[in-house]
């Protein structure tokens, strides 16, 4: 059986497979996918190797119509190294010569100039290029490597793997060399993988039951090492509680080296931020941190100083805590908007079972603009998602020069934020540097500012205008209103009528379905109409609503269904990569971003149109 | 690496007791299993007891069951075998051995034996 890094090299020309006779002879087949001699992978970012020989593809030399065969691999050779040029085209590295089907005389797979059909290569069974099954680093843990990848295939007794082994060893544990040949290199790790007593690498609290592993001995960047975690479906550590930090401090006290963390500021316009989502709530620096040093955007906890934490360039290499298992967040659920009726009093505006007021005018420092909201039967704003925020922001009348108290605040304990209405802190949203926490400036309350709606601590005696928000009454069935210019059953906002489609159907139905209400897939414009669209859609349980963006008319070249321009993205994190299809908005916990899926997958999706009575603007002219 | 050091063996009358202890040091990360073995002059080695990492689940082999337990301190990264009842046919030499997590890919380590001689 073909694992999911396994692949078949096909020529739709020919309807034929790469084949490895012999090492000295690759040549082509009718495919099979249970002919081993069939089967290639990835084993770095530019090396295939024959799952079979457990040898690699390359050339003797770089020049036009040579016969590609298996060598050794090697890692360093220019010869063995291949990548895909535009489609499907696969090339070596650097040159225009082309992985080529050979002739009729020529039964062998050539090195080749032409770039036709006959160097054109897909895997068997997909539309993808070679490179869609790409290669993932595996760090390794324990062992005497600092961590480094697996190098697949290595050599251990003379024998070539190419996948962890637990040869050598009687209790079952899978690990690596970390070099070709581990007999002379004598360097290796554990894999992280799924084996019997691999939860011993881990530490698990018994108060909470999350589990911490602490990788001491590594060596890595921020960025692998919260790969590492991943590879064992967890996150690099995030701290949201003192007995969380306590337990830590406890865990690597006798340690002395900093040890990376999930914090960090890499989002381009907003502050510090828990890899995992977490939110940021919790603050342990080290006296003079967080420095204010550009590219200082990762953070690593250190043993030899209480286990305080220190802004570093994120290229340092350190060792790193991963974190898994069970968070306390997930206990505070909020109701969707759809399932609670909400009615408000006049000037308060609606959303999920509570009502909102900001009030602008009437400046007040933080203690006042608490007791006024609590006077009015409710309290200083908290917020609790994403889509929470984006209704402020989208359908409050916030404005972008606005700085208004919301109800977070490290008043009662020092450098641990709650909520004024002692709601659990679930999310947080800093501004780009925030929190800042100048000690020489007590900032111990919390604003909203700027265009976003990002926050930023401030000291408590400003006075500034504030947001308020209390539980909305129920009345019993909730009245639907019909909303000004828009049909029963669809939203407005600003100039636009949408729609929930609540059938799951592909991007084509659904495209079809919106055609048939006289609207289209939804566009999405700019960051407003994302946010209202987050805040729409964001808490339902469906995981994906469908968008009007796809690269079907242009692979690679993402377009909206109606002839409209793309000025305007939301990507979740590593989208929309290499992949073709059809672009979804995500709920849940990474609600609004959007990622690509098979097109044929079947999702709800969200219509709009323009709402009636409503002067087109003229487009913009670039 | 790793280094396993028993100790505790000597000449004993049938019918007395014994306490062999084997303490593993070196670089190592867990203990996943251990075990004493035994070799009587001609024999094979055969198992004796051995005690999982984990769990501390344990394994005692028929012909010492009853008479012998064996129990590990984590702490000291120490395995006893406790002896009681010896018979003429239990003098042998007792190796130790680990399966250890360490610096290397291999997973066995092996002490170099302590005899244990049971005669009047």
């Known amino acids: 059986l073909l694992d999911t890094r396994q692949f078949l090299i096909y020529n739709e020309d020919h309807k034929r497979c790469v084949d490895a006779v012999s090492p000295s002879a690759v040549q082509t087949a009718a495919c099979n996918q249970d002919a081993e001699s069939q089967k290639f992978r990835w084993v770095s970012e530019s090396q295939i190797m024959s799952v079979a020989f457990k040898l690699c593809l390359g050339v003797p030399s770089k020049t036009d119509w040579v016969a590609i065969t298996l060598y050794a691999c090697d890692s360093k050779s220019e010869f063995q190294k291949w990548e895909c040029k535009n489609d499907t085209l696969l090339g070596i590295k650097g040159e225009d010569l082309f992985f080529n089907y050979g002739n009729r005389q020529e039964k062998n797979i050539m090195l080749y100039k032409g770039s036709g059909l006959w160097s054109r290569w897909k895997i068997y069974g997909t539309t993808d290029n070679l490179c869609s099954r790409g290669y993932e680093a595996m760090y390794t843990l324990l062992g005497n490597a600092n961590g480094a990848t697996c190098a697949f295939p290595f050599k251990f007794e003379n024998k070539w793997y190419a996948d962890c082994t637990s040869a050598g060893r009687s209790d079952g544990w899978l690990w690596c060399g970390t070099t070709t040949d581990y007999d002379t290199d004598k360097l290796f790790g554990y894999c992280p993988l799924k084996f019997e007593g691999s939860e011993s690498l881990w530490n698990k609290d018994p108060l909470t039951s999350v589990s911490y592993q602490i990788n001491s001995k590594s060596a890595l960047t921020w960025h692998q090492a919260r790969k590492s975690c991943q590879q064992q479906n967890a996150e690099l550590l995030s701290i949201t509680e003192i007995h969380e930090q306590t337990y830590l401090t406890g865990l690597t006290s006798s340690l002395t080296s900093g040890l990376w963390i999930g914090l960090n500021s890499l989002s381009f316009n907003s502050g510090w931020q828990w890899s995992d989502r977490s939110p940021f709530r919790y603050l342990n620096w080290l006296p003079g941190s967080p420095s204010a040093e550009p590219g200082k955007s990762c953070v690593s906890l250190n043993p030899g100083k209480n286990a305080k934490w220190e802004n570093l360039e994120c290229v340092q290499k350190l060792g790193y805590i991963c974190k898994k298992g069970n968070t306390t967040l997930n206990s505070f659920v909020i109701p969707s908007e759809s399932d609670v009726p909400t009615h408000c009093p006049s000037q308060w505006w609606p959303y999920a079972g509570h009502c909102y007021k900001i009030h602008r005018d009437e400046k007040k420092i933080q203690r006042d603009a608490l007791t006024t909201c609590r006077k009015e039967g409710g309290d200083l704003t908290s917020i609790h998602t994403i889509e929470e925020l984006d209704f402020i922001i989208s359908q409050l009348g916030y404005e972008p020069n606005d700085e208004l108290w919301i109800g977070l605040n490290d008043i009662k304990i020092q450098m641990y934020f709650e909520w004024s209405d002692g709601t659990p802190v679930t999310f947080t949203k800093w501004l780009r540097g925030e929190p800042s926490h100048e000690n020489n400036r007590q900032e111990d309350c919390v604003v909203m500012k700027g265009k976003d709606g990002y926050w930023a601590d401030r000291g408590c005696e400003w006075p500034l205008g504030y947001i308020c928000k209390m539980k909305s009454r129920s009345q019993g069935p909730e009245i639907v209103e019909v909303e000004k210019g828009c049909r029963k059953g669809w939203k407005k906002h600003h100039f636009y009528c949408y729609m929930i489609g609540h059938t799951l159907s592909t991007f084509a139905e659904a495209n079809q379905t919106c055609n048939n209400e006289n609207a289209y897939l939804t566009t999405i414009e700019d960051r407003y109409e994302q946010a209202f669209l987050t805040s729409f859609v964001g808490l339902r349980p469906e995981k994906y609503f469908w968008t009007g963006l796809s690269d079907i008319q242009t692979k690679g070249t993402f377009q909206w269904t109606i002839e409209e321009e793309v000025r305007f993205t939301h990507w979740n994190s590593d989208m929309p990569g290499r992949k073709p299809g059809c672009v979804a908005m995500r709920t849940g916990i990474a609600g609004g971003l959007w990622d690509v899926l098979k097109c044929d997958e079947k999702a709800k999706f969200v219509c709009k149109h323009w709402a009636e009575g409503v002067t087109h603007p003229p487009k913009p002219t670039t | 690496d790793v280094q396993l050091v028993e100790s505790g063996g000597g000449l004993v009358q049938p019918g007395g007791s014994l306490r062999l202890s084997c303490a593993a040091s070196?670089?190592?990360?867990?203990?996943?299993?251990m075990a004493w073995f035994r070799q009587a002059p001609g024999k094979e080695r055969e198992i004796v007891a051995a005690?999982?990492?984990?769990?501390?689940?344990?394994y005692v082999a028929d012909s010492v069951k009853g008479r012998f337990t064996i129990s590990r301190d984590n702490a000291k990264n120490t395995v006893y075998l406790q002896m009681n009842s010896l018979k003429p046919e239990d003098t042998a030499v007792y190796y130790c051995?680990?399966?250890?997590?360490?610096?290397?890919?291999?997973?066995?380590?092996w002490g170099q034996g302590t005899l244990v001689t049971v005669s009047s």
């Open positions: 051995k680990a399966v250890v997590v360490t610096t290397t890919p291999y997973s066995d380590y």
């Open positions: 070196g670089s190592i990360f867990t203990i996943n299993a």
């Open positions: 005690v999982n990492g984990g769990s501390s689940s344990t």
